[in-house]
């Protein structure tokens, strides 16, 4: 027989399968072009002196062989003997050690015997009821096959699965989707219900984010408010990089993580917008203003859990920027302005009352006055900071009043409310005799000290009942006592007190009389 | 569904060369193979060659062989076969029909084997 030629004779060893676990398996044959085929096996087992023959029976019985020698594949033409046209039985038979190693049969009609293509270009991934489904379109005039998947992790090794048939123009698969590690996979595709059949290769790597994107373990600092009012919001440690299977190392589009920034501007809510999202290596400056920031980690799947931080308001406080004036038509305050066409946000809200009791208004954009101020108004019917207590006053500016980052703080400081010179009227004035000409005048704070630094100063007036002569003594905002001195005996004093703001003067308290005795002596 | 026409047929003098085409239309990326038959009058039709689409592997009925060529042209949708016809023989005369198969059993020379049949296109060789 000639080599190229399928050998119709008996075949040149004896006819007995030795039933061996070692042999020829997982026989393989297809058309490799318009007239040629092949045919390639695996052989499991030592292979020194090993002959492998690939044996052919045809629809008619007769029956031939090819020598292979050593070689696991084989290729012959259509004009070797063997029927293309036709279906044909195939099986390998190798003679080694003087016995007869046989593989697996596969019968399959050789000139549609194509090997396919692999899944190319675009491949689909997406979420469907807790697994993976990939999606791709069927290479061309490829309908019809068997598809498996393989997928590793980082930390495990290929493991195979089963698509199941495809009889579209379209083909997908499901697939297992891991929670919390990143996987790739890999398809691969043979012809439809074609016994042996030659698998394609691989299809380039697919990778896959874990379900739940990783939780960002990230660390923040916020920096002090500078001249301008700003903050500087600072990353102190990166969000950890996914681990990717090996497959996936270097350019890996699907895994790819989105962390992004969330600031929640708590402080203002009159503002048009509370939010805004940034990319996370873009730091922000902030206001003073309290914040909520959450980093969201995001992938091809949606976002995953967020890590939320509260950045506390700066209560650095301005002791003097601050004017308020008080006529009869209402209040207005006066700042340091800003610059040219400024929206302000004044924000107040009671001291010790729970910071969702703030309350603000926005000014429309404002140029500064001649005098380089500032202006906000409201009148008392309005009931802005009305009630006799401490207010807790930011003021807030933007050019951009429509972008959150651009907030700055201008001033915050502390402003008693309503009629504060009646209400801030020291009350328990009482008089101890301290000495021959001198007395101890004492007094309960003024509600103003509940407000720091609105009282200036207590001031202190003695009136001689006899004479009508009046002194003042001014004592210090801390102090709720005074030592009147050089007083005479037998002589009708009265005492009062006042408490002062920087822009007001405070309402006397009720006269309280006094006289120090005359000392008898024996 | 796929819809297949010929065209390119005509006269032509003994030892003269033909070009026909068949443009399938339709569902194509669903077909594996198309081929070309040809039919006399009180005849069978009769297998001239066919070609594997995804690869280009061709397959010619022995009458034909060496002398006729397939070759096939994919775009989006549609795919064109072409069947070169050189050194023709007054025995080459008949109506040529394209047809297309979407599966990947039986024998391509039966008429059988395929599910989409062109309407025809008369070559007549004239001597």
């Known amino acids: 027989c000639r080599t190229s030629e399928c050998c119709f004779q008996d075949p040149p060893y004896p006819d007995a399968d030795s039933g061996s676990a070692s042999g020829p398996r997982d026989l393989r044959c297809y058309r490799i072009s318009s007239d040629r085929y092949e045919c390639s096996w695996q052989y499991e087992g030592p292979t020194a002196g090993v002959s492998h023959f690939l044996r052919c029976c045809l629809s008619s019985g007769r029956c031939c062989y090819f020598a292979a020698g050593s070689a696991t594949r084989l290729q012959f033409s259509d004009q070797a003997g063997v029927s293309v046209l036709y279906t044909v039985t195939l099986w390998v038979e190798s003679w080694a050690r003087n016995q007869t190693e046989k593989s697996p049969e596969v019968t399959l009609q050789l000139y549609n015997s194509v090997k396919y293509e692999p899944p190319l270009g675009d491949i689909k991934v997406s979420k469907l009821a807790g697994q993976l489904r990939m999606e791709w379109e069927t290479p061309d005039n490829q309908v019809g096959a068997e598809v498996q998947f393989r997928h590793r992790t980082p930390s495990s090794p290929w493991k195979l699965g089963d698509c199941g048939p495809q009889d579209d123009d379209t083909e997908s698969c499901l697939c297992p989707l891991e929670m919390n590690v990143a996987q790739e996979f890999q398809l691969r595709r043979r012809q439809l219900g074609s016994q042996g059949s030659s698998w394609s290769k691989w299809s380039s790597p697919v990778c896959v984010p874990p379900e739940n994107p990783p939780q960002p373990q990230v660390r923040f600092s916020v920096e002090q408010l500078g001249q301008d009012g700003r903050r500087r919001l600072t990353l102190k440690e990166q969000p950890t990089q996914l681990e990717l299977p090996e497959g996936c190392q270097g350019l890996a589009p699907g895994t790819e993580v989105t962390y992004r920034l969330q600031l929640h501007m708590l402080s203002c809510p009159c503002k048009a917008k509370a939010t805004r999202t940034l990319h996370l290596g873009k730091m922000p400056y902030l206001s003073g203003a309290a914040y909520n920031v959450a980093v969201i980690s995001s992938n091809q799947f949606g976002p995953g859990l967020n890590q939320t931080w509260h950045i506390p308001a700066d209560t650095h406080t301005e002791p003097v920027a601050l004017n308020i004036s008080v006529g009869t038509n209402g209040t207005t305050m006066y700042w340091p302005a800003r610059a040219q066409s400024m929206t302000y946000c004044i924000e107040w809200q009671p001291v010790g009352q729970d910071g969702g009791l703030a309350t603000c208004s926005l000014t429309a954009p404002q140029d500064p006055d001649p005098a380089g101020m500032a202006t906000y108004s409201w009148s008392r019917e309005s009931g802005a900071m009305g009630q006799e207590k401490c207010y807790y006053i930011t003021i807030f500016a933007s050019a951009h009043p429509e972008k959150l980052t651009l907030w700055s703080t201008v001033l915050s400081t502390y402003h008693f409310g309503g009629n504060a010179s009646a209400a801030g009227t020291p009350h328990h004035v009482s008089v101890k005799n301290h000495s021959l000409d001198s007395v101890s005048v004492d007094w309960a704070p003024s509600l103003l000290s509940t407000c720091p630094g609105v009282l200036k100063e207590y001031v202190v007036r003695c009136r001689d009942e006899d004479s009508k002569q009046v002194s003042e003594h001014p004592v210090q905002p801390t102090e709720t006592q005074v030592t009147l001195s050089g007083l005479r005996a037998g002589v009708a004093y009265t005492v009062q007190v006042r408490a002062d703001t920087a822009w007001l003067r405070g309402v006397w308290s009720q006269p309280q009389r006094f006289s120090i005795e005359v000392q008898v002596s024996d | 569904e796929v819809q297949l026409v010929e065209s390119g047929g005509g006269l032509v003098q003994t030892g003269g060369s033909l070009r026909l085409s068949c443009a399938a239309s339709g569902r194509t990326p669903s077909i594996i193979a198309m081929g070309w038959f040809r039919q006399t009058p009180g005849k069978e039709r009769e297998f001239v060659g066919e070609i594997i689409l995804s690869k280009g592997f061709t397959y010619y009925a022995d009458s034909v062989k060496g002398r006729f060529t397939i070759s096939r042209a994919n775009a989006k949708n549609t795919i064109t076969m072409y069947l070169q016809m050189n050194s023709l023989k007054s025995e080459d005369t008949a109506v040529y029909y394209c047809?297309?198969?979407?599966?990947?059993?039986?024998?391509?020379?039966?008429?059988?084997?395929?599910?989409?049949w062109g309407q025809g296109t008369q070559v007549t060789v004239s001597s």
């Open positions: 047809a297309a198969r979407q599966n990947w059993s039986g024998n391509p020379t039966r008429t059988n084997e395929y599910e989409y």
